[in-house]
């Protein structure tokens, strides 16, 4: 189990650490000014009590100022994820002051050291940032730090031993190990910003969570549930690399939530909106794509400030790669009535089509099972903009996908071998647009015809109602 | 090693203010907070609130909030903790525990006795 | 405020028993868990944090299990100096909040 009591051992040896050596002449944490989206520009140092690399570096006072802290390392240098994100910064926010927190020295150590640096880091980002404050125009609210990993925590401490309150703190993936039910000032926290915001893309419940699981900010988002990334599989990363290997699957999925914080600053003309759910199930189930009451918001730099009462967690589908834009759909389709379904539960597809195009044919996830004379819930997604729907093609998959499934039949068949045709009644399909929050009800083409069974196909067309908005708001983004 | 050291009994009167100290030692006294936790006689431990000396941001339970005020002297490595208006079921013993893991180590504790 | 709940309030065991006590946070706290064992006119002493992980010193018949809502403290087998009054307290969320106790007392 951890060592207790923090970054130099034990609490009891904190006043008894040897002080540097004469030779020692680089700090242990540097803070880098990048002056220029060119990586291989060396930027100017900024060091507490020394004004002149201030003026030298044009810092300005009055603008937003930005701390990007990496977290641990195995190799020692400056990943490529850093690059990328300091140049987005400089697209998005020119006048901006953009600052790399480098703790390299610190970080590259064995995981348990560098986590017990992670407070001395942080309470060295505080001291940064109340000399600062001792400037006339600098704010803290207007301070925005953005943490990976290990970084997120070390952010977390920044804020907490800062004099004052930081305006946000975005946590990209915040590390797991040693912080998964940590204490509320040992690890990142809603307490440590005015604003703090969370990605998690590599949470697992199985095994090591290399990315924290529980909830550690105002908004908490799971993008694809918070595990298994989409473009991360060791196949994707097989294709993409000469030497595949599960450590590049980890580094995938827990660098992703830093490349969809960078798409939210370069392509902000394509959003992403995560939706409020109480767990990954439900949302799998569609139950949850309402922005009503604040339940959807923007994710990465576009996300609107929240601060509720009780942390707000929130999932959202991507695609593989950049822009990760979706666009979710909630279909609730009401079987009412369906004859001998026996033990499997059918295989269905659907086919959106759209006035500006048309969708892939798209599985229904069943997550539970299919209830007969309910209505069943279920989540699409698609990675094109289909504009208004028109109308939908529901199909029943026939021949059995999965060797479980065909043994189920086969067992099926054998208890009741004169079993007759599987088939499910549908009138209609109700779908709602996650991010335009309309809804639409499609009938069955021919109201005489609303069965379905296996190998066969039903079709929807808009009923006449057609769209209608009812008391819902569409996700707006409300730029920075 | 860890020591919080609180000061000695008090015996107020209804109404009145009391003002008990805490004072750390064998380590980094800025950079940990110092809660305060108080047990009434025969009675469970319910929390009052948190300083963290560095900065001197307090976080306060509501229940306590306008009656209670936390503070320190950064130079002597103290906390205290002021509590006014005091009524009879104020009367507790009153720790201070110093917050790393859980409330990792705490005071001997301060007997506070109202009654008129 | 999160609300947390031990059980039972009070048990009588011997040397030697495997004794267990709950405690049920009233919202999902993860495992943002502490256990505290107070002996009668002395502090409060921590056992175990984060659910399940013993603090320095304590005895491994001392250990920690759940996560949500539902937390479990166990003595694998009770010994003398053991016969005290055990709290859980979540440290999930601002204002900390301790459970009610449990007092283990000797048969």
């Known amino acids: 189990s951890p060592v207790p009591f923090g970054p130099e051992g034990r609490l009891e040896d904190k006043l008894h650490k040897p002080k540097a050596t004469q030779t020692e002449v680089k700090p242990s944490v540097r803070f880098n000014l990048r002056t220029s989206k060119d990586p291989e520009h060396e930027g100017c140092y900024l060091s507490v009590g020394h004004s002149q690399p201030l003026e030298d570096c044009s810092f300005n006072m009055t603008a937003k100022t930005f701390f990007i802290i990496h977290g641990w390392t195995m190799s020692g240098i400056f990943e490529n994820w850093l690059h990328k994100l300091v140049s987005a910064l400089h697209t998005r926010e020119k006048d901006a002051n953009v600052v790399v927190v480098d703790w390299l020295p610190l970080a590259h150590q064995l995981y348990t050291d560098a986590v017990n640096n992670t407070r001395v880091v942080g309470h060295s980002i505080a001291r940064m940032l109340d000399w600062l404050q001792e400037k006339d125009d600098f704010s803290l609210g207007n301070v925005h730090l953005i943490g990976y990993s290990l970084g997120a925590h070390v952010a977390g401490y920044a804020g907490n031993f800062v004099k004052g309150t930081v305006g946000r703190i975005t946590g990209l993936d915040p590390a797991g190990p040693m912080f998964e039910g940590a204490d509320i000032h040992k690890r990142l926290s809603p307490d440590d910003a005015d604003f703090v915001d969370v990605l998690h893309t590599y949470t697992r419940s199985f095994g090591l969570s290399i990315g924290i699981q529980m909830p550690v900010g105002h908004i908490d988002i799971y993008p694809n549930g918070g595990d298994f990334q989409p473009g991360c599989g060791l196949n994707d990363v097989l294709g993409s690399i000469a030497y595949g290997t599960i450590t590049e699957v980890v580094k995938c999925e827990h660098e992703r939530a830093v490349h969809l914080f960078v798409d939210s600053l370069v392509n902000q003309d394509k959003p992403s909106f995560a939706f409020q759910c109480t767990d990954s199930n439900r949302f799998k189930k569609g139950i949850c794509l309402s922005c009503r009451k604040n339940r959807c918001n923007s994710i990465g730099y576009n996300a609107k400030k929240m601060r509720n009462k009780r942390n707000s967690k929130m999932y959202l589908k991507t695609r593989a790669g950049m822009p990760f834009r979706v666009y979710h759909y909630q279909m609730k389709i009401h079987v009412f009535s369906y004859k001998n379904m026996g033990e499997i539960e059918p295989t269905f597809y659907v086919t959106l089509y759209g006035t500006n195009a048309d969708s892939q044919t798209l599985p229904l996830e069943i997550v539970e099972r299919i209830e007969q004379n309910a209505t069943n819930t279920f989540l699409v997604y698609t990675e094109e903009d289909l504009g208004d729907l028109l109308k939908i093609q529901l199909t029943w998959e026939g021949a059995s996908q999965s060797w479980y499934n065909l043994w189920k039949e086969f067992r099926s068949y054998l208890s009741q071998p004169r079993n007759p045709g599987r088939e499910l009644n549908i009138r209609r399909i109700r779908v709602k647009s996650g991010e335009t929050q309309r809804k639409l009800t499609f009938c069955t083409e021919d109201p005489e015809n609303t069965s379905i069974s296996p190998g066969r196909e039903l079709w929807f067309r808009k009923c006449r109602d057609g769209w209608r908005m009812k008391n819902e708001t569409s996700p707006t983004v409300e730029l920075p | 090693q860890v020591q919080l050291v609180q000061s000695g009994a008090e015996v107020k009167k209804p109404g009145a203010s009391v003002k008990v100290s805490c004072k750390a030692s064998g380590y980094t006294f800025t950079t940990y907070w110092i809660a305060w936790v108080r047990q009434a006689p025969g009675q469970g431990l319910e929390w009052m609130g948190e300083?963290?000396?560095?900065?001197?941001?307090?976080k306060y339970n509501k229940k306590f909030k306008g009656r209670v005020t936390m503070t320190r002297d950064t130079s002597t490595s103290t906390v205290y903790m002021e509590l006014s208006s005091l009524r009879s079921e104020d009367t507790a013993v009153y720790y201070c525990?110093?917050?790393?893991?859980?409330?990792?180590?705490w005071g001997q504790g301060t007997t506070v006795t109202v009654s008129s | 405020d999160i609300q947390m709940t031990q059980s039972p309030s009070s048990l009588s065991a011997s040397v030697g028993d495997r004794v267990t006590i709950t405690c049920k946070a009233s919202?999902?706290?993860?495992?943002?868990v502490a256990w505290y064992q107070q002996k009668p006119g002395k502090s409060p002493k921590l056992l175990i944090y984060?659910?399940?992980y013993r603090f320095t010193g304590v005895p491994s018949r001392f250990s920690g299990s759940g996560a949500g809502t539902d937390f479990t403290l166990t003595i694998s087998s009770l010994q003398p100096e053991d016969f005290a009054t055990y709290y859980c307290q979540q440290h999930y969320s601002i204002p900390r909040t301790f459970g009610g106790g449990t007092k283990v007392e000797i048969k």
């Open positions: 300083i963290l000396p560095g900065s001197a941001k307090t």
């Open positions: 525990a110093v917050y790393d893991y859980g409330a990792d180590y």
């Open positions: 984060s659910a399940s």
């Open positions: 919202q999902d706290v993860y495992t943002a």
